[in-house]
């Protein structure tokens, strides 16, 4: 029951996280800035991974998409790539985890298959979360290092004088959404991986067993070793040779002609 709860909770947390990563990637407010020197009105500029917007105090907003790839900083391209990889991995992870959920029965899918799928989706969620956190952190670092306070450089261009407009860049809402979403996806992935351990089938309990014959007249029955899997002749999973079965953890006797495993 605890395994099902852990798996279900991991799925829900990851789902929320991936939804957040998608939202952050689409948002325009990755960086925000006030244009201090505007002589007309208060102007607020905010930009995301895909477009830049200017909002005036009158309420007018104009957005322009980054149609050119040449003028974009390499870091911005890297952030775009990280976020998209995060979304794709997360989406695949969600698809896999739906089929892996213990509460959902699909044909005669074994627990071992569900365990493997849970582990796979968990790893995908972890990588997805890390991609989102990395992407947001790279962008934040780009703001801090390059754009925190642009200096008022003045130089003369072909058409007259040019100077950099003094603007203060700050972290936009999308950065915080991205960090939280990435963290949630990461936590969800870890929960899925933990749930995977509990989903692993119990057949391993009888795999490492040495059978010691108690008498010279006892013969080996092929169905005995397969009892735990339910595929042998002993289909009711009754242990054969109870008196002589010992796990490898126990002290073992020296091999003799009566040891069959």
């Amino acid at each position: 029951m605890a395994v099902t709860a852990c798996q279900g909770l991991g799925f829900v947390v990851s789902l929320i996280g991936i939804a957040g990563i998608i939202a952050a990637t689409c948002m325009d407010q990755w960086s925000t800035q006030d244009l201090y020197n505007n002589p007309v009105t208060a102007v607020f500029n905010y930009q995301g991974l895909w477009r830049s917007c200017v909002r005036e105090s009158s309420g007018f907003t104009e957005c322009r998409g980054y149609f050119t790839l040449l003028g974009l900083p390499a870091m911005l391209q890297a952030v775009r790539a990280l976020m998209i990889v995060g979304i794709v991995l997360g989406a695949i992870g969600l698809l896999v985890s739906i089929f892996a959920l213990k509460c959902i029965r699909i044909g005669s899918m074994e627990d071992s298959a569900k365990a493997n799928m849970t582990l796979t989706s968990g790893i995908m969620f972890i990588v997805s979360g890390l991609c989102a956190i990395a992407g947001v952190s790279v962008f934040a670092n780009m703001l801090v290092t390059n754009f925190w306070m642009s200096t008022a450089n003045m130089y003369t261009g072909m058409g007259g004088m040019v100077q950099t407009v003094q603007t203060r860049y700050t972290f936009g809402a999308a950065l915080f959404v991205g960090w939280v979403a990435g963290g949630l996806t990461l936590i969800g992935g870890v929960m899925m991986c933990i749930a995977c351990r509990g989903l692993a089938p119990e057949e391993t309990n009888y795999k490492a067993v040495s059978y010691h014959a108690s008498g010279h007249s006892v013969a080996y029955k092929p169905g005995g070793f397969k009892a735990s899997t339910g595929f042998g002749s002993n289909t009711k999973n009754k242990k054969i040779y109870d008196g002589g079965a010992r796990t490898e953890d126990e002290v073992q006797s020296y091999p003799s002609k009566h040891d069959y495993v």
């Epitope: 007309v40 040449l70 100077q163």
Partner: nanobody, 122 residues
């Protein structure tokens, strides 16, 4: 490379009219505010009028009611219609624009034109 090219200046009699125009050209990504400043001999450069992309305007007190600023966003061009000109309007008129270039979509630059001479004299 971005260029601001002013035109329409010249000699005019007091009470006359002139229409200045300024076209921004080059690798422009986004323009915010465009405006006109003027500098009379021996004086500091002062704002005449400015207009944002959304159409919000600001005029200096000395030109209110006489000058009208307008803008064509599609052509990246700003106009200044000057009526009832006075001798004290004589100055070099500079076009100004806050913009981002395609080569750096994260930084705003303030570009200035070379200026056009307006002389009001009888």
């Amino acid at each position: 490379q971005v260029q601001l090219v002013e035109s329409g200046g010249g000699l005019v009699q007091p009470g006359g009219s002139l229409r200045l125009s300024c076209a921004a050209s080059g690798s422009i990504f986004q323009i915010n505010t465009m405006g006109w400043y003027r500098q009379a001999p021996g004086k500091q450069r002062e704002l005449v009028a400015a207009i944002t992309t959304g159409g919000s305007t600001k005029y200096s007190d000395s030109v209110k009611g006489r000058f009208t600023i307008s803008r064509d966003n599609a052509k990246n061009t700003v106009y200044l219609q000057m009526n009832s000109l006075k001798p004290e309007d004589t100055a070099v008129y500079y076009c100004n624009a806050d913009l981002k270039t395609n080569s750096n979509v994260f930084t705003w630059y303030e570009y200035w034109g070379q200026g056009t001479q307006v002389t009001v004299s009888s």
